[in-house]
């Protein structure tokens, strides 16, 4: 039951994360740059990994897509491409993490690959948070070291002037969302993980000789107690003690990876 | 690199009218600002309007009702009707644009080179 529970609410909280990520990528509100007031009215600039915005305080909201792949700073290629490679891998991990749940059975699906997928999506989940983290603190560095805003200069352009003018860029929203997301996915998949080692079969069975007592037909198994995890039910846990003896191929056994021989 | 192409200025009568355009052209993002300064002989650049593309203007004092400012958003143009104009307003006037670069490059103000304006009694 915890396991499951555990499970469950790794993937709900992953799912929340991931959704969270889209949201960041998709918002225009990774930097901002404060009202500033001029004679004509109030203007508020806002910039997303995708397009510029600019709104007035009349309402009037205007934006424009960045005009090439090519002219864009690397940091920002870097964090576009972080925050995709973190969609990416958590969508596929929320895929994989569907068919892992304990609660939904499909076909014959054994514990084992149960476990196992629940640790992919898991890892999966963890290093999409971490993307998110990381494209968003790659960013949030940028805005602070301010690189393109050191000095107001002006000089002479295409025929005309150019001056820049001095200004600050802050955080916005979406920074923030992308680092609440970031850390929602990256716990979501740390519970997976979790989940992962009470979903894991860690029986230990004892292949054993039969032995054969003079005057009755019993097999004593030594071992026929199973060890368990201590996870979910076991309902194999009995006392194997059979009415005749028999060969160790007869008796039908679930060998795992951590039998001792 | 952003180009402010100026065209419509000339010699005219006083009482006369003209109509400047300014047409920006480039790798343009947010534009917060278009308008016009200009500059008499002998004196300091001043503002003759501006307006938002949301078509909030602003006017030097008395030019308000004289001149008209508006733009097309479509293009990226700016244009300033001058109407009744008088030998003061002779000057070199340059059309203006502040941009938005944001994280690409921060706030800018381009000016263009100017187109001269002579009105003769």
């Known amino acids: 039951m915890a396991v499951t529970a555990c499970q469950g609410l790794g993937f709900v909280v992953s799912l929340i994360g991931i959704a969270g990520i889209i949201a960041a990528t998709c918002m225009d509100q990774w930097s901002t740059q404060d009202l500033y007031n001029n004679p004509v009215t109030a203007v508020f600039n806002y910039q997303g990994l995708w397009r510029s915005c600019v709104r007035e305080s009349s309402g009037f909201t205007e934006c424009r897509g960045y005009f090439t792949l090519l002219g864009l700073p690397a940091m920002l290629q870097a964090v576009r491409a972080l925050m995709i490679v973190g969609i990416v891998l958590g969508a596929i991990g929320l895929l994989v993490s569907i068919f892992a749940l304990k609660c939904i059975r499909i076909g014959s699906m054994e514990d084992s690959a149960k476990a196992n997928m629940t640790l992919t999506s898991g890892i999966m989940f963890i290093v999409s948070g971490l993307c998110a983290i990381a494209g968003v603190s790659v960013f949030a560095n940028m805005l602070v070291t301010n690189f393109w805003m050191s000095t107001a200069n002006m000089y002479t352009g295409m025929g005309g002037m150019v001056q820049t003018v001095q200004t600050r860029y802050t955080f916005g929203a979406a920074l923030f969302v992308g680092w609440v997301a970031g850390g929602l996915t990256l716990i979501g998949g740390v519970m997976m993980c979790i989940a992962c080692r009470g979903l894991a079969p860690e029986e230990t069975n004892y292949k054993a000789v039969s032995y054969h007592a003079s005057g009755h037909s019993v097999a004593y198994k030594p071992g026929g107690f199973k060890a368990s995890t201590g996870f979910g039910s076991n309902t194999k846990n009995k006392k194997i003690y059979d009415g005749g003896a028999r060969t160790e191929d007869e008796v039908q056994s679930y060998p795992s990876k951590h039998d001792y021989v | 690199e952003v180009q402010l192409v100026e065209s419509g200025g000339g010699l005219v009568q006083a009482g006369g009218s003209l109509r400047l355009s300014c047409a920006a052209s480039g790798n343009i993002l947010s534009i917060n600002y278009m308008g016009w300064y200009r500059q008499a002989p002998g004196k300091e650049r001043e503002l003759v309007a501006t307006?938002?593309?949301?078509?909030?203007?602003n006017y030097q004092g008395n030019l308000k009702g004289r001149f008209i400012i508006s733009g097309d958003n479509t293009k990226d143009t700016v244009y300033l009707q001058m109407n009744n104009l008088q030998p003061e307003d002779t000057a070199v006037y340059y059309c203006?644009?502040?941009?938005?670069?944001?994280?690409?490059?921060?706030?800018?103000?381009?000016w263009g080179p100017g187109t001269q304006v002579t009105v003769s009694s």
């Open positions: 203006y644009f502040r941009i938005n670069f944001g994280i690409l490059g921060g706030l800018r103000d381009y």
């Open positions: 307006i938002t593309r949301g078509g909030s203007t």
